[in-house]
């Protein structure tokens, strides 16, 4: 369960891939599309508000008692819109919704690299946000070796 309903911290950052492509958001036909693209020099990067929540891992699963804490994040590129995992379509979508947010909007934060993060679906363990054909998609990671796969690694930057 997520500890409390308010985030422990919030962080406004631009999101880019391991290969330094930017994640951008465009309003098209009253809905937002998500793109993975190379920005031109000096082109402004889109910012995402990351809200960090503590989540207690159930002690019967972890063996940690009260010690098994995970860090969950929600990602909001614009007011009232959040990234959602659509597990049926294996897609990542922007949905407008009110709080409390649904579980599909929460992602377990991983560091597989000192300056990169990965986002694992709360609703589908082992499935991560990744890059596929210049779009964000949900990618199944079937072994710990594949956790370092570049297409699920993202960089957060304040600039």
């Amino acid at each position: 369960s997520i500890t409390g309903i308010s985030p422990i911290t919030e962080y406004l950052a631009s999101l880019s891939t391991y290969n330094d492509q930017s994640i951008t958001f465009a309003l098209e036909d009253e809905s937002y599309e998500i793109y993975v693209e190379d920005l031109k020099k000096d082109e402004k990067k889109d910012k995402v508000l990351l809200s960090y929540y503590e989540s207690q891992h159930p002690s019967n699963e972890s063996g940690d008692g009260v010690d098994g804490k995970m860090l969950m994040v929600t990602l909001s590129p614009t007011k009232d819109f959040w990234l959602h995992a659509n597990n049926k379509e294996h897609s990542v979508e922007l949905h407008k919704c009110e709080k409390p947010l649904p579980d599909q909007a929460f992602f377990v934060l991983h560091n597989m690299h000192s300056n990169c993060v990965s986002f694992e679906c709360k609703t589908d363990p082992g499935v991560f946000i990744g890059v596929k054909d210049n779009h964000l998609a949900l990618i199944k990671v079937d072994s710990s070796e594949n956790l370092c796969t570049e297409n699920i690694l993202f960089k957060l930057s304040e600039t």
Partner: antibody, heavy 122, light 107 residues
Framework: EVQLVESGGGLVQPGGSLRLSCAAS????????MTWVRQAPGKGLEWVAS????????YYPDSVKGRFTISRDNAKSSLYLQMNSLRAEDTAVYYC???????????????WGQGTLVTVSS | DIQMTQSPSSLSASVGDRVTITCLAS??????LAWYQQKPGKAPKSLIY???RLQDGVPSRFSGSGSGTDFTLTISSLQPEDFATYFC?????????FGGGTKVEIK
Amino acid sequence: EVQLVESGGGLVQPGGSLRLSCAASGFTFNNYWMTWVRQAPGKGLEWVASITYTGGGTYYPDSVKGRFTISRDNAKSSLYLQMNSLRAEDTAVYYCTRANYYYNTYGGFPYWGQGTLVTVSS
Amino acid sequence: DIQMTQSPSSLSASVGDRVTITCLASEGFSNDLAWYQQKPGKAPKSLIYAASRLQDGVPSRFSGSGSGTDFTLTISSLQPEDFATYFCQQGSKYPLTFGGGTKVEIK
């Protein structure tokens, strides 16, 4: 109860090697990043090495890079620090620490071992 | 590298005093900042994480604040067991770095 117990410290000559161990218990070891931090006598704290929860990534400051190697055995819930080409300035108490959350580095080090003293002297 | 400058390096205070320790970073970063307390011959103990979150079991007289480059640890009413050395640490960018420490002594 989370426990981290370091061992392997001692007196070693300059240029020598030493292997520190940290036995972890009371938590799911393979879900956490682990880190070594050291403290020279009468001085402050210095980060020495970190390793990802899977063991696939390792990180070091320039002061120890190429000389120290951090590793882990998740099956044994153990963390190691192989120290080669030791110098007088490596003399310190070495602490084994555990990250705050599963899978990531955020939130500092809530758990520390008691430390093991490494003395590099001829 | 992010340099963490703690001030003061030492201070003298009495039981009941309000004590403030600051940590200044050489560049701004997300609020992945922790504070530790250390007593002679002992391992450091985590007090605060995420700049302002109290670690489990830490008395509420300890509090943390700040963001960007300026961070503060406050002890609202100093107790006898609080005389120790305090360190800040940033975890936002590698290499991980600590402040030089602040020794809180009895006046």
